[in-house]
């Protein structure tokens, strides 16, 4: 027994190290032999029969969403949807798990990350990690050539997930993509716009677009002396300029990527410039790279692609910055992502760290890699990275103290008396039956102060009172929570007085 | 029975290399991790070095680090210290022990000692 | 590194005393600690780790407390075999290191 009491005690100890390894932010190297030694220790702990201690929690990287968080995703979700619909986008779902060889070889360093299912019946599943290769699996299946679709659904990501920035194992993208064969830039421009246009409604603060294309990163490590095998893998270490200093960065490419000193040193040359259109006409005149037939395409194509930005007011918002190489394998084009500039922390607030808040890019050899003959179907889009978004909104709502409704009870049927639980259900059937949203206590007798604080916790606007003599009258009071003022109002003008006070459409259309 | 038995040690000149072995025995020697300690003549003791069951990690006093190599062969639950360009002050008995409850760097089972002197 | 300063350096008590070693952290150490009994010519004897977890088949007169940077050894009636050397060492982060000492003698 006192053993068993030594070894928890060391768990416990145990497990406060490794927390406050990670705080510190101590070298992984670290963190994993102290997190190795916490799981010996429990091993060997074993279950104790005595008091089964089964710790009740969602797993890790997840999280359940309260009534208040979920008010305030839809908030979010409708900003969104209301902007993808505005840009005339269909929608459509697939499954939350695809065969395992779907996934594969599309995501490059990141396929490590692709939850896989056990075991179904001889199918190879995997719980999908993103919602564009799905999407491409959907046109080459169904043979579509041309769509316009957005999809909000969750995706599943084996990550190491800081939960307080933002970043689940589970969590949901909101993508938009227009599939087909167009004028170039013209639907790489539309996405950008309605990156911006979503941002903006959202009102979390300053942000700012990074663009670059991938053609301009291989044209560019071409002439710089990386080898085709390296590009990949090199593009993954340039990623990281926005986290890390670019000694850093050149210290992984030569130490651990095995790049040549002055060929890193040629690529920072290029990678730590950003700007605008300038320094896309700077990088046409450049000797080297106008020389490489596929920056030179890049660079002809960001070139149209700003003049599209101007046309659509958000050329303010975009930079073209060299050091994005947005880790996934699929894009070949244009590539962007939105990060914001400063998080709208109060005075004295830690501002919120959740770096990107929506990214994209345009992948044209996607589709084909599902196409028995390979035929191609050109492909751009954008995904919304809610989850941050979400953190952000409630923090800051948080912050404000803002009062969130998590209901949209227009109206409690209340009663001033005893015995009028009849009456009262009666009243509230014909609510709903018009379409207002009422809601009534679930008690025979309930005193009306109770039913008046119930409006003031929920924010429920209106209260309608039955009373004795109302019902002789053939009247309601109609009362308004905040101001409390009541007036009597025929029974038959309830309704339209409602949804009058509450703005509601006078039909239900 | 559960117990640890150091070898190797003797005199050495300054400049020399030994290797130090430790046999242990009566325990899954391989679900520990290991470690030397050292105690100069008539002083205190001193961490040396440590290696877990796995082989994956090892740490080095700063005092050895890059003149001394912690090794173990699990199959033949045996744990080595291969000590080069070895100086004066390395002079010590070496205790190789091992740690309570598999990882914690406290040390439950210790060997005899075996004496190691560097001396011109 | 952390240091770890025993007092006192040596003590003579008579046998069925209640005697008392300290040992203070450079720096706070949760309780990573542990004591150690050496008898000359021998490799020390774990006798409690942990803080205040006593080691298996160590007798209970023999107790540990304390924790962060201040920690305590008590033996609550001394034995004749309990005069020795004691030491503290502490296991929180490597390299782990020891008290230098603490000689018990009889008085």
């Known amino acids: 027994m006192a053993e068993r009491a030594a070894l928890e005690e060391l768990v416990k100890l145990q497990g406060e190290r490794v927390r406050g390894l990670k705080q510190q932010k101590a070298s992984a190297e670290l963190i994993e032999e102290e997190v190795a030694k916490l799981l010996k220790l429990k091993a060997q702990l074993g279950p104790d029969e005595s008091k089964q201690k089964f710790v009740l929690k969602t797993p890790k990287g997840t999280r359940d969403y309260s009534p208040r968080q979920m008010a305030v995703r839809e908030k979010v979700f409708d900003v969104i949807i209301r902007c993808f619909k505005r840009h005339g986008a269909e929608v459509i779902d697939t499954p939350v798990f695809e065969l395992k060889e779907t996934l594969m070889g599309k995501y490059g360093e990141d396929s490590k990350l692709i939850y896989d299912l056990k075991d179904q019946g001889g199918e190879l599943l995997s719980l999908r990690y993103d919602l564009t290769v799905p999407f491409a699996r959907y046109l080459a299946m169904n043979k579509l050539t041309n769509i316009k679709r957005y999809h909000i659904a969750k995706v599943y990501r084996r990550d190491n997930p800081a939960m307080t920035r933002g970043r689940y194992r589970e969590f949901y993208q909101c993508d938009f993509d227009i599939a087909g064969n167009f004028d170039p830039m013209i639907p790489d421009a539309e996405c950008l716009k309605i990156m911006c246009e979503i941002l903006s409604s959202l009102q979390i603060g300053d942000f700012l677009v990074k663009v670059n294309d991938r053609r301009i990163l291989d044209g560019m490590f071409a002439i710089c002396g990386v080898s085709d095998s390296k590009f990949r893998t090199i593009c993954s270490s340039v990623d990281k300029l926005d986290k890390v200093s670019w000694e850093e960065v050149k210290n992984e490419m030569v130490g651990e990527k095995g790049l040549a000193p002055e060929v890193a040193d040629r690529i920072g040359d290029y990678v730590q410039q950003h700007g605008g259109v300038s320094l896309v006409e700077q990088l046409l005149q450049d000797p080297k790279l106008s020389q490489n037939k596929q920056a030179l395409e890049g660079l002809g194509d960001l070139k149209l692609l700003f003049e599209y930005l101007t046309l659509f007011g958000i050329d303010d918002k975009i930079s073209f910055d060299l050091s994005l190489a947005r880790g996934l394998d699929y894009y070949t084009g244009v590539i962007y992502e939105a990060v914001l500039l400063q998080t709208p922390a109060q005075a004295g607030e830690e501002p919120l760290g959740v770096g990107s808040v929506a990214a994209g890019g345009r992948y044209d050899g996607l589709v084909g890699m599902f196409d028995p003959k390979g035929r191609k179907v050109p492909c751009v889009g954008l995904s919304i990275g809610v989850e941050r978004i979400f953190s952000i909104v409630e923090q800051r709502l948080e912050a404000l103290e803002e009062k969130i409704r998590t209901t949209e009870t227009q109206v409690l049927v209340a009663s001033a008396q005893k015995k009028l639980l009849e009456e009262r259900l009666k009243l509230v059937s014909e609510l709903w039956d018009a379409g207002i949203k009422a809601e009534l206590l679930y008690k025979k007798n309930p005193k009306l102060l109770n039913q008046l604080q119930y409006c003031e916790e929920a924010g429920i606007p209106l209260v309608a009172i039955i009373g004795e003599q109302e019902l002789k009258d053939g009247v309601i009071k109609l009362r308004s929570v905040t101001s409390r003022e009541e007036v009597d109002v025929r029974r038959e003008d309830l309704v339209e007085e409602i949804k009058r006070r509450t703005g509601q459409p006078l039909c239900i259309c | 029975q559960v117990q640890l038995v150091e070898s190797g040690g003797g005199l050495v000149k300054p400049g020399g290399s030994l290797r130090l072995s430790c046999a242990a025995s009566g325990f899954t020697f391989s679900d520990y991790y290991m470690t030397w300690i050292r105690q100069a003549p008539g002083k205190g003791l001193e961490w040396v070095s440590y290696?877990?069951?796995?082989?994956?990690?090892?740490n080095y006093a700063p005092s050895v680090k890059g003149r001394f190599t912690i090794s173990r062969d699990n199959a033949k639950n045996s744990l080595y210290l291969q000590m080069n360009s070895l100086r004066d002050e390395d002079t010590a008995v070496y205790f190789c022990?091992?740690?309570?409850?598999?990882?914690?760097?406290?040390?439950?089972?210790w060997g005899q000692g075996t004496l190691v002197t560097v001396s011109s | 590194d952390i240091q770890m300063t025993q007092s006192p350096s040596s003590v003579s008590a008579s046998v069925g005393d209640r005697v008392t070693i300290t040992c203070r952290a450079s720096q706070g150490i949760s309780s990573w600690l542990a004591w150690y009994q050496q008898k000359p010519g021998r490799a020390p004897k774990l006798l409690i780790f942990a803080a205040s977890s006593l080691q298996s088949g160590v007798p209970s007169r023999f107790s540990g407390s304390g924790s962060g940077t201040h920690f305590t050894l008590t033996i609550s009636s001394l034995q004749p075999e309990d005069f020795a050397t004691y030491y503290c060492q502490q296991a929180e982060s490597f390299p782990y290191t020891f008290g230098q000492g603490t000689k018990l003698e009889i008085k």
């Open positions: 022990a091992r740690y309570v409850y598999q990882v914690v760097a406290i040390g439950d089972l």
């Open positions: 290696i877990s069951g796995s082989f994956r990690y090892t």
